[in-house]
């Protein structure tokens, strides 16, 4: 029997390479049974995850799963960092794994670093 707990399917240690100035949608895949839970996004600052209050979000519904989307329109250099979604379900807080955005600022980067350079040498993001 399938569990009716809410589950947040952000992949563990997932990473995204994105360009400043581009639009980007960060998806939080949500599985639920009956009532859609209240889901929020936060951005990690050290060990604290700061709730993103004034950001554009939306839901996308598919057959077996729903997506709570955080919109970046456009991506800004300071959007670089790790994000997490969380859901309130039956008085419980369910937290996703964090997902990391590596933002390349096209104005200051003469050549776009590879995804692996950004993962292993994050200072490239701030040149």
């Amino acid at each position: 029997k399938e569990s009716c707990d809410v589950q947040l399917y952000i992949k563990r240690q997932s990473e995204h390479s994105i360009l400043a100035g581009d639009p980007f949608e960060l998806e939080c895949p949500v599985k639920y049974c009956a009532n859609r839970p209240h889901v929020t996004w936060c951005k990690l600052n050290g060990t604290t995850c700061v709730k993103l209050e004034d950001r554009q979000t939306s839901w996308k519904e598919e057959k077996n799963i729903s997506f709570f989307i955080l919109h970046f329109e456009p991506v800004l250099p300071n959007d670089n960092g790790s994000y997490r979604c969380s859901a309130n379900f039956q008085s419980n807080l369910i937290e996703s794994h964090s997902t990391t955005l590596y933002v390349t600022d096209v104005k200051s980067a003469s050549e776009r670093p590879s995804k692996d350079e950004m993962a292993s040498r994050p200072w490239l993001l701030y040149r």
């Epitope: 589950q7 992949k11 563990r12 997932s14 990473e15 794994h97 995804k115 692996d116 993962a119």
Partner: antibody, heavy 120, light 112 residues
Framework: QVQLQESGPGLVKPSGTLSLTCADS????????IHWVRQPPGKGLEWIGR????????RYNPSFKSRATISSDKSKNQASLKLSSVTAADTAVYYC?????????????WGQGTTVTVSS | DIVMTQSPDSLALSLGERATINCKSS???????????LNWFQQKPGQPPKRLIY???KLDSGVPDRFSGSGSGTDFTLTISSVQAEDVAVYYC?????????FGQGTKLEIK
């Protein structure tokens, strides 16, 4: 049923490029990570790297960083490995493996492996 | 890189004896999510590795309960309570917490 199947040339010339494909069935690769692991004759297992097929983001073992390229094709449900400037030391059995998703994140399914010999 | 050191490199036991394989990591494998991504694989000649144990102690489906895993932080153990002929194989630990992922060098189990 989850299956992974590696394929590619069994013989590669020194200084050439090794190219392998991992054809996956029974699951959607974009929901997982695909890893490549190799095993030289009579030796242990060596992790080469992994890809997130959902967005193409890769991670490599620094030992292979400059020579390895992992890619994926969601439409074909397959992943690929290219290893450039090969030498005899790259002779090995090459495996692709799936990292299952929530909540365990471990290599739960492997291909049978394909033997690659580097020789002129 | 995280170095995974297994001991012993090989062991030869009689049928029914207890096998203990140790794996030591150079750093803690406890992840930020509170889980420890330490796995054990069994590899028989001419076959790909097969997952036996994940998250330190969870047994894969179909794996006999004579296999067990334990440990935390940097020290882990695979135990076979009563070795059977079909357990002859090489056993590898693997860490999935840090990049790059790393395997132990392997422990070869033989029957005396």
């Amino acid at each position: 049923q989850v299956q992974l199947q590696e394929s590619g040339p069994g013989l590669v010339k020194p200084s050439g490029t090794l190219s392998l494909t991992c054809a996956d069935s029974g699951f959607n690769i974009k929901d997982t990570y695909i890893h490549w692991v190799r095993q030289p004759p009579g030796k242990g297992l060596e992790w080469i790297g992994r890809i997130d097929p959902a967005n193409g983001f890769t991670r490599y073992n620094p030992s292979f960083k400059s020579r390895a390229t992992i890619s994926s094709d969601k439409s074909k449900n397959q992943a690929s490995l290219k290893l450039s400037s090969v030498t005899a030391a790259d002779t090995a059995v090459y495996y692709c493996a799936r990292e299952d998703g929530y909540p365990y994140y471990t290599l739960d399914a492997w291909g049978q492996g394909t033997t690659v010999t580097v020789s002129s | 890189d995280i170095v995974m050191t297994q001991s012993p490199d090989s062991l030869a036991l009689s049928l029914g004896e207890r096998a203990t394989i140790n794996c030591k990591s150079s750093q803690s494998l406890l992840d930020v999510d509170g889980k420890t991504y330490l796995n054990w694989f069994q590899q028989k000649p001419g076959q790909p590795p097969k997952r036996l144990i994940y998250l330190v102690s969870k047994l894969d489906s179909g794996v006999p309960d004579r296999f067990s895993g334990s440990g935390s932080g940097t020290d882990f153990t695979l135990t076979i309570s009563s070795v059977q002929a079909e357990d002859v194989a090489v056993y590898y630990c693997w860490q999935g917490t840090h990049f790059p992922r790393t395997f132990g060098q392997g422990t070869k189990l033989e029957i005396k």
